[in-house]
């Protein structure tokens, strides 16, 4: 991790965009820890491999994370 | 529209201190990491430092570390650079600049918002 | 520490013509991390590409980016008058944690 600091967070900014499901490669959420003190949602996108930061109070960001449950929901027998 | 306004530069002697402040409106101003960047005069630009959007991520660059610090108020809309023994090499325009959305330490997204700077001049 | 240099230090081409300015790290980058800015004189930085190919918002498709490891490119396909300017390349991951370039000034011919 390239960054040095004391407390060991993955996001310097979030975004409130509303992310497609079909677009995502993976969605990461990093619990709230005494090495970051916040939760942290990190979407891995499949075009580029992009990554990015969402924000998880936000009412799209909270829609995803919801489509996605569901979705694995469906898939698990 | 988004906007980045700095303010806070002047003439300083060396060995003193000063503080910038980066005004920020038309956005989130608490979603979005920031920077500051400076410009010796007819020279290249050198990043000084970064603050992620709640202040917990901090950076600086070795040739300021130890002497500034970089702050923010997100209920003012405002960023800092507290500025302190200050030397002739200093001297330059400093930029506040945002993070682009959604930057981490896994992808970068670029400095995607700008001010007009403020112009620092250290001499005795 | 990852140093960026980039060549030609100074571009001088005609509108209508083809740049290429390269961007050169002492170490391999990630392309994740690997940005272009333009600059005009008495202005502010203007972000135009970042992940080293992606074009920022509102950045005409005339920009192009590309490269990996340590060797990255801006290619700007035909220069117009609002084209020549200073360019920059930026990467993050070492210490100091954020580098530019020296720069490449794209002037008329």
């Known amino acids: 991790v390239p960054l040095s600091r004391t407390v060991r967070c993955t996001c310097i900014s979030i975004s409130n965009q509303p992310v497609n499901p079909r677009s995502l490669e993976k969605l990461e959420i990093i619990p709230a820890s005494q090495f970051c003190p916040r939760v942290e949602i990190i979407a891995t996108m499949k075009k580029k491999g992009e990554k990015r930061c969402l924000n998880p109070e936000s009412k799209a960001i909270k829609n995803l994370l919801k489509a996605v449950s569901k979705e694995r929901s469906k898939r698990s027998p | 529209q988004v906007q980045l306004v700095e303010s806070g530069g002047g003439v300083v002697q060396p060995g003193r201190s000063l503080r910038l402040s980066c005004t920020a409106s038309?956005?989130?101003?608490?979603?979005?990491?920031m920077h500051w960047v400076r410009q010796a005069p007819g020279k290249g630009l050198e990043w000084v430092a970064v603050?992620?959007?709640?202040?917990?991520?901090?950076g600086y660059a070795d040739s300021v570390k130890g002497r500034f610090t970089i702050s923010r108020d997100n209920s003012k809309n405002t960023l800092y650079l507290q500025m302190n023994s200050l030397r002739a090499e200093d001297t330059a325009v400093y930029y506040c600049?945002?993070?682009?959305?959604?930057?981490?330490?896994?992808?970068?997204?670029?400095?995607?918002?700008w001010g007009q700077g403020t112009t620092v001049t250290v001499s005795s | 520490e990852i140093v960026l240099t980039q060549s030609p230090g100074t571009l001088s081409l005609s509108p209508g013509e083809r740049a290429t300015l390269s961007c050169r790290a002492s170490q391999s980058v990630s392309s994740s991390y690997l940005a272009w800015y333009q600059q005009k004189p008495g202005q502010a930085p203007r972000l135009l590409i970042y992940?080293?190919?992606s074009r920022a918002t509102g950045i005409p498709d005339r920009f192009s980016g590309s490269g990996s490891g340590t060797d990255f490119t801006l290619t700007i396909s035909r220069l117009e008058p609002e084209d020549f300017a200073v360019y920059y390349c930026q990467q993050y991951g070492s210490s100091p944690i954020f580098t530019f370039g020296p720069g490449t000034k794209v002037d008329i011919k």
């Open positions: 600049a945002r993070e682009g959305a959604g930057s981490s330490v896994y992808y970068y997204y670029g400095m995607d918002v």
């Open positions: 038309g956005f989130t101003f608490s979603d979005y990491g």
């Open positions: 603050i992620g959007y709640g202040g917990l991520i901090k």
């Open positions: 992940g080293a190919s």
